[in-house]
């Protein structure tokens, strides 16, 4: 069964297909489930989840974050601005999701599923935003050098980076989910 679909839906072809909003909502919740599984392995493997040194490592990462100006919060919400921010943010997260590949032992398939499902989610959202201004895509060269830099870190920093990516991606998706429900 593909991510974002119920086996019941697949088995019942007479039922209407999911609307765009339903697909997006379901896809985000599927990815969030995957993140939870990855976080579980990360937290079991190291003490990063309780570490107080997060801020130290976070300074070296430029993870996408929702800010007031992005129009995704309850105060100052703006449907168009927010949709652009969600898509841009997900595109920026892609390099970090690539970094997560090979960072897991027992959850290797789950890490791949999160990455692939995010690509599908981006496609869903781009269809929804087809009338909006062009969305800027991250520069592939910049992404390649960032990936090399992250992979060259020592073990402790790599563990911390993994933890921070998962935590930030979870927060970003939760904010996106809340915002998309007003769209």
């Amino acid at each position: 069964v593909p991510p974002g679909e119920d086996s019941k839906d697949v088995a019942a072809p007479h039922r209407q297909p999911l609307t765009s909003s339903e697909r997006i909502d379901k896809q985000i919740r599927y990815i969030l489930d995957g993140i939870s599984a990855l976080r579980k392995e990360t937290c079991n493997k190291s003490n990063m989840c309780e570490s107080s040194k997060e801020a130290l490592a976070e300074n070296n990462l430029n993870l996408p974050k929702m800010a007031e100006k992005d129009g995704c919060f309850q105060s100052g919400f703006n449907e168009e601005t927010c949709l652009v921010k969600i898509i841009t943010g997900l595109l920026e997260f892609e390099v970090y999701l690539e970094y997560l590949q090979n960072r897991f032992e027992s959850s290797e398939e789950q890490a791949r599923a999160v990455q692939m499902s995010t690509k599908v989610l981006i496609q869903f959202l781009q269809k929804k935003a087809k009338n909006l201004d062009a969305i800027t895509t991250p520069d592939p060269t910049t992404n390649a050098s960032l990936l090399t830099k992250l992979q060259a870190q020592n073990q402790w920093l790599q563990d911390m980076t993994t933890h921070l990516i998962l935590r930030s991606f979870k927060e970003f998706l939760q904010s996106s989910l809340r915002a998309l429900r007003q769209m």
């Epitope: 609307t19 339903e22 919400f77 449907e79 429900r181 007003q182 769209m183």
Partner: antibody, heavy 120, light 111 residues
Framework: EVQLVESGGGLVQPGGSLRLSCAAS????????MSWVRQAPGKGLEWVSR????????YYADSVKGRFTISRDNAKNTLYLQMNSLKPEDTAVYYC?????????????WGQGTQVTVSS | QSVVTQPPSVSGSPGKTVTISCAGT?????????VSWYQQLPGMAPKLLIY???KRASGIADRFSGSKSGNTASLTISGLQSEDEADYVC??????????FGGGTHLTVLG
């Protein structure tokens, strides 16, 4: 204090038109998806239509599709329902409702309603 | 479009517990956790009690609780009080981008 005040209801003949308005205050109107819900005399509630916070997406109940149009003016903090080709079965109290923030399909504030009567 | 089914009426004595059911299909009540419950007093607009199946709305007493099993959602009111006498309506998201309401249940508090 959140307030939703409906207006524009009244008596109209079958086939006629009406435009309902809902003036919102006490909250950032442009941040919320909004809906119209109606209640026929002595009957249950019926969901009519929904509009997204920025007005990009709209949804309608099958019973009103093609006849009713939901719209909003965020600069005026106002929600509208244009009702054309009205039928006697459209007779009801029409409520303007706000969707709870970040929640899928729950209505946290309701106006007091405006009565629409379709009769010859 | 079929209405989600609720019993027309239920009753209970003060201090007791009552449960109101809301039976739908896999396309509405059974689809996701998108059930909400409302209290409606005569001549008044409905008031949100429960959303997302089991989350209490702001300011709602913990005597009110919600749950769901399969295609049926339930609202439970414990420690019944005379002021609980009202109509209770469930609502659910329905696949395809619409919503559906139950027919409503009138709660009578005896005595």
């Amino acid at each position: 204090e959140v307030q939703l005040v409906e207006s524009g209801g009244g008596l109209v003949q079958p086939g006629g038109s009406l435009r309902l308005s809902c003036a919102a205050s006490g909250f950032t109107f442009s941040s919320y998806a909004m809906s119209w819900v109606r209640q026929a005399p002595g009957k249950g509630l019926e969901w009519v239509s929904r509009i997204s916070s920025g007005g990009i997406s709209t949804y309608y109940a099958d019973s009103v599709k093609g006849r009713f149009t939901i719209s909003r003016d965020n600069a005026k903090n106002t929600l509208y329902l244009q009702m054309n080709s009205l039928k006697p079965e459209d007779t009801a109290v029409y409520y303007c409702v706000r969707y709870a923030w970040g929640v899928q399909w729950a209505f946290d504030f309701w106006g007091q309603g405006t009565q629409v009567t379709v009769s010859s | 479009q079929s209405v989600v089914t609720q019993p027309p009426s239920v009753s209970g004595s003060p201090g007791k517990t009552v449960t109101i059911s809301c039976a739908g299909t896999s396309s509405d009540v059974g689809y996701g956790n998108y059930v909400s419950w409302y209290q409606q007093l005569p001549g008044m607009a409905p008031k949100l009690l429960i959303y997302d199946v089991s989350k209490r709305a702001s300011g709602i007493a913990d005597r009110f609780s919600g749950s769901k099993s399969g295609n049926t959602a339930s609202l439970t009111i414990s420690g019944l009080q005379s002021e609980d006498e009202a109509d209770y309506v469930c609502a659910s998201y329905r696949r395809g981008g619409t919503a559906v309401f139950g027919g409503g249940t009138h709660l009578t508090v005896l005595g």
